[in-house]
């Protein structure tokens, strides 16, 4: 008999190399039977995982599996790091493996000044 537990299918030590300035969708594959669980994303800060409150998320439903998506519009240098999705199901908390984003900053400091530098340059 197939298990009706919620399962989160993020592979152990999964990673994504992405460019800052472009959009990206981070997917958490979720398998459930009847009622879709409440799923959240968090970002690892040391040993604690900080819940991402003000970020855009959505569901994508497919035949055998659903995906809870964290949207980056666009990716920022600060988005570099490890993320985890968690599901609340029948009072149980199920946590995924962490997945790591490696963000490359295409607009490197050598290529263009930051807005703060522009402002200080204006007043100099």
């Amino acid at each position: 008999k197939e298990s009706c537990d919620v399962q989160l299918y993020i592979k152990r030590q999964s990673e994504h190399s992405i460019l800052a300035g472009d959009p990206f969708e981070l997917e958490c594959p979720v398998k459930y039977c009847a009622n879709r669980p409440h799923v959240t994303w968090c970002k690892l800060n040391g040993t604690t995982c900080v819940k991402l409150e003000d970020r855009q998320t959505s569901w994508k439903e497919e035949k055998n599996i659903s995906f809870f998506i964290l949207h980056f519009e666009p990716v920022l240098p600060n988005d570099n790091g490890s993320y985890r999705c968690s599901a609340n199901f029948q009072s149980n908390l199920i946590e995924s493996h962490s997945t790591t984003l490696y963000v490359t900053d295409v607009e490197s400091a050598s290529e263009r000044p930051s807005k703060d530098e522009m402002a200080s340059r204006f007043w100099a």
Epitope: D22, Q56, E73, P74, E107, K115
Partner: antibody, heavy 120, light 106 residues
Framework: QVQLKESGPGLVAPSQSLSITCTVS????????VHWVRQSPGKGLEWLGV???????SYNPAPMSRLSISKDNSKSQVFLKMNSLQTDDTAMYYC??????????????WGQGTSVTVSS | QIVLSQSPAILSASPGEKVTMTCRAS?????MHWYQQKPGSSPKPWIY???NLASGVPARFSGSGSGTSYSLTISRMEAEDAATYYC?????????FGGGTKLEIK
């Protein structure tokens, strides 16, 4: 220096389509996103969509079905096409550059806008 | 979509007076941008990410807030500050603007 300039038809008949070109200089479309924002007396400022540096697009879900944004990197041009125009699409249409810092994203340079009137 | 409500819609201030306008979001946002627009001109970036002044913006301007409540303050009103100010959120698509606060000089 960074510049964006919109060119459009000015007057469009109801139910017809609108095409606006945004020609940019001082930056590359492969590095920065370009947004379309319109401003009408009735609706105020409304973000329509963006052409991201890598060629993907994001749209405002409300007018999304009528919108199409494309670009030509070599000509430094971004194109907005909107179908089935109605009188409430009358507005000033702006193209705007998007830029990011370490932890935020914003629209920093705006074109002067092109005025579009939908009328028969 | 996140609705941004600006208040007051119209604000009249005397030179030298302290001015505060607010922007309330229907849902929590990470930060708020502010743009200044004068008649016949395009909007100009004024405050980035809640509190960072854009290039060329006088130091009498400041921004603050978090969650659903944000504000723009002018410590001492000057004639050149008369304009319409729009708040703008980049947290959730569609990326929305407030209806604007028109600041007039008395």
């Amino acid at each position: 220096q960074v510049q964006l300039k919109e060119s459009g038809p000015g007057l469009v008949a109801p139910s017809q389509s609108l095409s606006i070109t945004c020609t940019v200089s001082g930056f590359s479309l492969t590095t920065y996103g370009v947004h379309w924002v319109r401003q009408s007396p009735g609706k105020g400022l409304e973000w329509l969509g963006v052409m991201w540096p890598g060629g993907r697009t994001s749209y405002n879900p409300a007018p999304m079905s009528r919108l199409s944004i494309s670009k030509d990197n070599s000509k430094s041009q971004v194109f907005l096409k909107m179908n089935s125009l109605q009188t409430d699409d009358t507005a000033m249409y702006y193209c705007v550059r998007g830029d990011y810092e370490y932890d935020y994203y914003a629209m920093d340079y705006w074109g002067q806008g092109t005025s579009v009137t939908v009328s028969s | 979509q996140i609705v941004l409500s600006q208040s007051p819609a119209i604000l009249s201030a005397s030179p030298g007076e302290k001015v505060t306008m607010t922007c309330r979001a229907s849902s929590s946002v990470s930060y708020m941008h502010w743009y200044q627009q004068k008649p016949g001109s395009s909007p100009k970036p004024w405050i980035y990410a809640t509190s960072n002044l854009a290039s060329g913006v006088p130091a009498r301007f400041s921004g603050s807030g978090s969650g659903t409540s944000y504000s723009l303050t002018i410590s001492r009103m000057e004639a050149e500050d008369a304009a319409t100010y729009y708040c703008h959120q980049w947290s959730s698509n569609p990326y929305t603007f407030g209806g604007g606060t028109k600041l007039e000089i008395k």
